[in-house]
Structures are given as C-alpha cells and as structure tokens.
C-alpha cells in the first residue's frame, strides 16, 4: 500500500532570464527512494539515481543544474519554460510517486512564489 505523499513548491513564478529551484519532498513513507526523474511535460530533464548520482539530459545540459538535494535548478529562463514540471520518485517497495509543479515565467519583475501544496 502506498502511504507516502509528495510535497512540492506548488505554483511558482519567476522572471525571464532568471533562475528557479524546483523542489519536491516525499514524506509519510519508509520506502527507499531509488531514483528521481524530473520531467517537463513531454521532456525528460534530469535523473538523480540514489547510488549513481545525477545525469542531465543532453537537451538541457546548458540550462539545468542538479540540486539542491533532489531538487532541480532551471537557469536562463525563457517564456517557453512556462508549464508543468513533474518530479517522479521511484521507490522500493512502494512504486512510483509523482509531484506536480506549475512554473510561470514572467516578462516583468513581478514574480512571486506560490503556496506549497501536497499531492497524495
């Protein structure tokens, strides 16, 4: 039975040209995290393997940095980066947990962080 929940940074916004940290946290389970995949809608951004470390997709090598922790830092943001991001936790023995973050990249400097929310 999957008892865990994923807490994410929720709906967030950032300025064009700036950086943003995407964060997820898995709680309420003793399952072992074997890997975390970060995806942007249709694209695989990065993989963090518990034993082997990080790999960044060749498509995003210049704009994505690993961490902090199991999070992901997006750099040199463009308006095209607006959209849904998913943290996919592969765990044993529970299986897969998925968290969702919506990022809006703004032209102006009126970028504010949204509230955190949980996905069961």
């Amino acid at each position: 039975m999957m008892t865990g929940t994923i807490e994410t940074t929720g709906n967030i916004s950032a300025e064009k040209g700036g950086s943003i940290i995407l964060q997820c946290h898995l709680s309420s389970t003793t399952a072992q995290v074997t890997q975390v995949n970060w995806e942007q809608q249709d694209q695989l951004l990065a993989i963090c393997n518990a034993d082997l470390g990080w790999h960044i997709s060749p498509s995003f090598k210049d704009r994505v940095a690993p961490g902090p922790g199991l999070g992901l830092t997006l750099q040199s943001l463009t308006v095209n980066d607006t959209g849904e991001y998913f943290c996919i936790y592969h765990t044993y023995p529970d299986g897969t947990y998925t968290g969702r973050i919506f990022l809006e990249v703004l032209e102006s400097s009126v970028a504010e962080h949204g509230a955190r929310f949980q996905i069961p």
């Epitope: 809608q41 249709d42 694209q43 393997n49 082997l52 470390g53 790999h55 498509s59 090598k61 592969h90």
Partner: antibody, heavy 119, light 107 residues
C-alpha cells in the same frame, strides 16, 4: 516480451525518399523516448534522431538535420523516420531503439532494416 | 561534437583471459558513458550505463569504470560468447556519439 521491428528499407536513388517504420510491442510505447541509430556497412554506429515520448520535441545530428524527420504514433505504438534527399552516404542498416527509463541510453533495439542509396 | 576514441581497434584474447578496452572522450563527459556489445548480424546490446552500472541481465564479468575523459570496459574472464565488437557512447551532449568500436577476437 519487448519487441521492436523495423520495416520500410530498400533500394532508393540519390535524392529520393523513404519512410521507415518501427512497430513496437511488449511495453507501453507512450511512456518511452525513442531513437533511430544507423550503421553503414562494416562501420560503426551513428545516432540519427531522438523523439520525446509525446512527440513534442525532436533532435538530430547535423548530418541529417533538415532531411530526416522522426515522428511517432502512440495510438499505433509505432515510430517513424521520414528520409528525404537521400545520399549515398545514408546507406546503412537503420535501427530503432528504446531509451531506458533510468538513463539516457538505449536498452532495446530492433533487428534493423537496410537502406541502400544508389543509382 | 565530442569524439569518442576507442583502443585498440582489435584485441586478440584467449578464452578465460582478461580483456581491457579503452575509450577516450575529446572533452569531459562526466559519467555519461555507455558500452554496447554487437555480434555479427545482430543489433547492439546495452552492457553498461552511467559508466559503471551493469544493465539488467549482464554477467558480472563485465565491468565499467572511469569518469571525465577516460573510460574502461573490462571483461574479467572471456567466454566464447563474448567475442564481438564493443562500442562506447557518450550521452553528455548532442550530438550523441559512439566510438569506432573494438573487435575482441579469439587468439
């Protein structure tokens, strides 16, 4: 059992076109990123194209960019490679391959289909 | 483009002996390197990913090591089914590139 079966290869004249297909089974096709890789006779491997799982983004090396187009039909569990303006140097066995779900490498490959470009 | 250079081009080894294959990248690729085995008339088979992780079902006699620009595939005790061509591949940046291959043949 995971299976990838390429088809559509054959003899084509320089400047001609060909469309390769890769029929897949044994896994949820729409959950996987896919590749085409080729191998000229007696030569090494060369990456040709990459497509994201929903088909929204594609990537190519300069050697085929603007001439080759990778696409997919998730409803039919099929991957495609449209090859236009073919040249003699495109002669090769073309393999479709599935990206692993834990890395950016290729864990399952088809048996390949031979494309010969010659007049 | 990152050039992957494999050496030697051909390696003659007796069954039961150890084989060491080298792959050098023209620039730092971290641990974004895979090794594939290909037998005549067959498709390549993934052996090693992340420079050192064995793919599912790959015998323990195959091991990978290295990071940055220098990588090694070691076959600790060659079996008859191991005689084949081995390719390294980098997936650190586009275009994805393969080495020219090392043919492991029976001595």
């Amino acid at each position: 059992e995971v299976q990838l079966v390429e088809s559509g290869g054959g003899l084509v004249q320089p400047g001609g076109s060909l469309r390769l297909s890769c029929a897949t089974s044994g896994f949820t096709f729409s959950d996987y990123y896919m590749y085409w890789v080729r191998q000229a006779p007696g030569k090494g491997l060369e990456w040709v194209a990459y497509i994201t799982k929903g088909g929204g983004s594609t990537y190519y090396p300069d050697s085929v960019k603007g001439r080759f187009t990778i696409s997919r039909d998730n409803a039919k569990n099929t991957l495609y490679l449209q090859m236009n303006s073919l040249r003699a140097e495109d002669t090769a066995v073309y393999y479709c391959a599935r990206q692993t779900n834990y890395d950016f490498t290729m864990d399952y490959w088809g048996q390949g289909t031979l494309v010969t470009v010659s007049s | 483009e990152i050039v992957m250079t494999q050496s030697p081009a051909t390696l003659s080894v007796s069954p039961g002996e150890r084989a060491t294959l080298s792959c050098k990248a023209s620039q730092d690729v971290g641990t974004s390197v895979a090794w594939y085995q290909q037998k005549p008339g067959q498709a390549p088979r993934l052996l090693i990913y992340w420079a050192s992780a064995r793919h599912t079902g790959v015998p323990a006699r195959f091991s990978g090591s290295g990071s940055g620009t220098e990588f090694t595939l070691t076959i600790s005790s060659l079996q008859s089914e191991d005689f084949a061509v081995y390719y390294c591949q980098q997936y650190s940046s586009y275009p994805l590139t393969f080495g020219g291959g090392t043919k492991v043949e029976i001595k």
